[in-house]
Interface confidence: low
């Protein structure tokens, strides 16, 4: 009867430089000894090596020399007694590309190289990008923990070095941005900026990076009303505080633009004397058109901003005058500075 030496292992495996791969493997060999149980030793060799004196890439035999370049990176995983020859390859290097064969040795009778089932390993350029994890949405002023990890990397080989960059991090000591984890307290101005995590395997020229655009939620700020006069001057009055009185001539046409900075965008609505204005008069962008203003169409105009992180409003008084004076005068109810003319 022919002795049964069988090996189940995939013919080829591809891994990106610096990453890890697990190659499942099982084997069988003839063993019918009732009287002694010598140790079972298994080996992975580079193809073309002579098993008797070559250095191995991985083994469970403590007396055999392992190639320095694969030491700690090529490891046997699983229980060889259960005929598991699975091979873990970590921190893959371009020079690892090639063929490998498996060998089993037990006592005097079992010494066999499975030359017909070779494993072909191909190491390709690193295109895997790190993952940046954090709980969304980011909220202005609330500290958030971000983590960076490289899928497919594992414990084998030298550790990974992390570098974080981005305007939201400035100014940080390099030491703070070298960890895989980072605590960020975003500001409104960080919304839309880029955050990059770069991963490098220490001692290797293998780097990869991922950039994410920060989506920072923040409450409404810089609420302002701009009043545009359609009298050819192109002048705009900018109202930044409540209670300002704006005199205008009867028959003039105005555009009122309410602007606010927030994320997500706030909902803007206009009120006159406390009553919501007809949506047909206002646009989605918060612009209100007042064509050919009549004597009774003045009063308090309010822009109301509604947002999940807070609501605000800004009011001014439109005083419609019948006089034929051509000057545009602006007064405030309370003492204070004159509005900014832009």
């Amino acid at each position: 009867e022919k002795p049964v030496y069988e090996l189940q292992v995939q013919k080829s495996v591809t891994v990106q430089e610096g990453l890890c791969v697990l190659v499942p493997c099982s084997f069988s060999y003839p063993w019918r000894s009732w009287y002694s149980s010598p140790p079972l030793y298994v080996y992975w060799f580079r193809d073309g090596e002579i098993p008797y004196y070559a250095e191995v890439v991985a083994t469970n035999n403590p007396d055999r020399r392992v190639k320095p370049e694969t030491q700690g990176r090529f490891r046997l995983l699983g229980d060889v007694q259960k005929k598991n020859c699975s091979l873990s390859i970590g921190d893959a290097r371009m020079e690892d590309t090639g063929s490998y064969f498996f060998r089993v040795e037990r006592g005097r009778d079992v010494k066999y190289s499975y030359q017909q089932n070779k494993l072909n390993l191909e190491v390709t350029a690193l295109i895997e990008k790190p993952d940046i994890h954090f709980l969304e949405p980011l909220e202005s002023g609330r500290p958030t923990r971000l983590s960076c990890s490289l899928p497919g990397s594992c414990e084998a080989g030298p550790p990974l070095t992390f570098s974080w960059t981005g305007n939201a991090l400035s100014p940080l000591d390099p030491e703070t941005t070298r960890s895989s984890e980072l605590t960020l307290t975003p500001r409104p101005e960080d919304h839309g900026t880029n955050l990059t995590c770069q991963v490098k395997r220490q001692g290797a020229q293998v780097t990869t990076e991922r950039t994410v655009q920060l989506n920072v939620s923040y409450a409404p700020q810089n609420l302002a009303i701009s009043i545009f006069f359609r009298n050819g001057t192109g002048t705009a009055l900018r109202i930044l505080s409540n209670g300002m009185s704006v005199p205008i001539q009867e028959g003039q046409s105005l555009f009122l633009a309410c602007t606010v900075d927030s994320n997500p965008p706030a909902s803007l609505s206009w009120f006159r004397e406390g009553k919501a204005l007809n949506p047909s008069q206002t646009s989605m962008s918060g612009t209100l058109e007042l064509p050919n203003i009549g004597a009774r169409e003045g009063g308090e105009f309010t822009c109301r901003v509604q947002h999940p992180l807070g609501s605000q409003h800004l009011s001014f008084i439109l005083s419609v005058q019948r006089s034929s004076s051509s000057c545009i005068c602006v007064t405030e109810k309370q003492q204070g500075s004159w509005p900014l003319l832009t």
Partner: antibody
Framework: EIQLQQSGPELVKPGASVKVSCKAS????????MYWVKQSHGKSLECFGY????????YYNQKFKGKATLTVDKSSSTAFMHLNSLTSEDSAVYYC???????????WGQGTLVTVSA | DIVMTQSQKFMSTSVGDRVSVTCKAS??????VAWYQQKPGQSPKSLIY???YRYSGVPDRFTGSGSGTDFTLTISNVQSEDLAEYFC?????????FGSGTKLEIK
């Protein structure tokens, strides 16, 4: 605080060789590449090459290949540049610089002036 | 090798002015560009990395911009201590290469 301390100025004769050292402190020496940069008098900066202290592997700018040998002593966190067959063209200030990946080169040594003169 | 061209060898400015130093790469280098300031007899001082990020401790009057092949270092409100030579450098590919430098003179 990260510091790169270079050896003092050297006056050597043409054809001789010189060894410039750069002692690193304040960070894990084997984590980051050490660059060597040449600056001739009144000229710009040129990258000579770098060495990866983790495995001692050097990279040489083809333009200067054969002119320098880069080595490290991990036990003392020191990088060395050995310049050979010196000519007047090699008279320059040589800087070691710590390369920090995406951060470029944030730290430089104070420079070592090498003067080649008969 | 990637060539970094700083076409202006000298630039003259006055205290309080705003000045822009430009640098052009022969190939696309993304944002892997740094700017250095060098004063006579001193080693280069790192100002900007990754095209637009200031190193810690660098005054905010120094700003970097650009990506791809065109890069600018802008100094607003120039101070007398800014009198120096400014170099750009790419670290997108080996060998790392530097621009020829732009000397800033104060009138």
């Amino acid at each position: 605080e990260i510091q790169l301390q270079q050896s003092g100025p050297e006056l050597v004769k043409p054809g001789a060789s010189v060894k410039v050292s750069c002692k690193a402190s304040g960070y894990s020496f084997t984590d980051y590449n050490m660059y060597w940069v040449k600056q001739s008098h009144g000229k710009s900066l040129e990258c000579f090459g770098y060495i990866d202290p983790y495995n001692g592997g050097p990279y040489y700018n083809q333009k200067f290949k054969g002119k320098a040998t880069l080595t490290v002593d991990k036990s003392s966190s020191t990088a060395f540049m050995h310049l050979n067959s010196l000519t007047s063209e090699d008279s320059a200030v040589y800087y070691c610089a710590f390369y920090y990946g995406y951060y470029g080169v944030p730290y430089w040594g104070q420079g070592t002036l090498v003067t080649v003169s008969a | 090798d990637i060539v970094m061209t700083q076409s202006q060898k000298f630039m003259s400015t006055s205290v309080g002015d705003r000045v822009s130093v430009t640098c052009k790469a022969s190939h696309n280098v993304g944002t892997s560009v740094a700017w250095y300031q060098q004063k006579p007899g001193q080693s280069p001082k790192s100002l900007i990395y990754s095209a637009s990020y200031r190193y810690s401790g660098v005054p905010d009057r120094f700003t970097g911009s650009g990506s791809g092949t065109d890069f600018t270092l802008t100094i607003s409100n120039v101070q007398s201590e800014d009198l120096a030579e400014y170099f750009c450098q790419q670290y997108n590919s080996y060998p790392l290469t530097f621009g020829s430098g732009t000397k800033l003179e104060i009138k």
